[in-house]
Amino acid sequence: CKAMHVAQPAVVLASSRGIASFVCEYASPGKATEVRVTVLRQADSQVTEVCAATYMMGNELTFLDDSICTGTSSGNQVNLTIQGLRAMDTGLYICKVELMYPPPYYLGIGNGTQIYVIDPEPCPDSDF
């Protein structure tokens, strides 16, 4: 297992609709054709695998398990979007990248993106 650098933004604020997007960029030492991306959440004394996708370079990311994630890849960048977030989902979201094929296997883990989620205030009753 060889180490690889992964960069991601330090902080992201989710939209009022509970959507947060960030870029996960990895320094690929070679020409990988199969890449696995996993998003981990660290907060509330828990570590959660939020979503995971394995993709072939140039193809769309496919997430399993009715995932709250979607994403696209472009070169050594993965554009991740997490939706359906609630205030209780606030936490540190860590991007983990694995170069699966061809060998050798490379693993990179980012420092994490702190995603802040604020539940929207209910709309006040209006006479109009």
């Epitope: 959660t48 398990d65 979201y93």
Partner: nanobody, 126 residues
Framework: EVQLVESGGQLVQAGGSLRLSCAAT????????LGWSRQAPGKEREFVAA????????AYADSVKGRFTISRDNAKNTVYLQMNSLKPEDTAVYYC???????????????????WGQGTQVTVSS
């Protein structure tokens, strides 16, 4: 309605291992995330681990990460909790529960789960 029945709890020495099982009945079992919680004497119930519908995604409490492994066999409608390097503080009644909604969450809280089973007692002696 999904019903969950836990088994496998027993008395074990510190450093030992146990595997808990949670058998489910109900047609919708494979559509839901399932989780384990525990309650020690005189303490509040706490989240332990969870696993997504297909078994590809997992969540762990920091206190058990690296020691416990959650898995599921959808063909057998069963979820497992493999517990290694057990400590006296792992002594508790362990419960299996079903997530209230289809899909997978970023965070896991006991309020998100229902259909808890009756529990199985795990006692770790020093």
């Amino acid at each position: 309605e999904v019903q969950l029945v836990e088994s496998g709890g027993q008395l074990v020495q510190a450093g030992g291992s146990l595997r808990l099982s949670c058998a489910a009945t109900g047609r919708t079992y494979n559509s839901y995330s399932l989780g384990w919680s525990r309650q020690a004497p005189g303490k509040e119930r706490e989240f332990v681990a969870a696993i997504s519908a297909s078994g590809t995604l997992r969540a762990y409490a920091d206190s058990v990460k690296g020691r416990f492994t959650i898995s599921r066999d959808n063909a057998k409608n069963t979820v497992y909790l493999q517990m290694n390097s057990l400590k006296p503080e792992d002594t508790a009644v362990y419960y299996c529960g079903r997530h209230r909604s289809v899909g997978w969450r970023a965070s896991h809280h006991l309020s998100d789960y229902d259909n808890w089973g009756q529990g199985t007692q795990v006692t770790v002696s020093s």
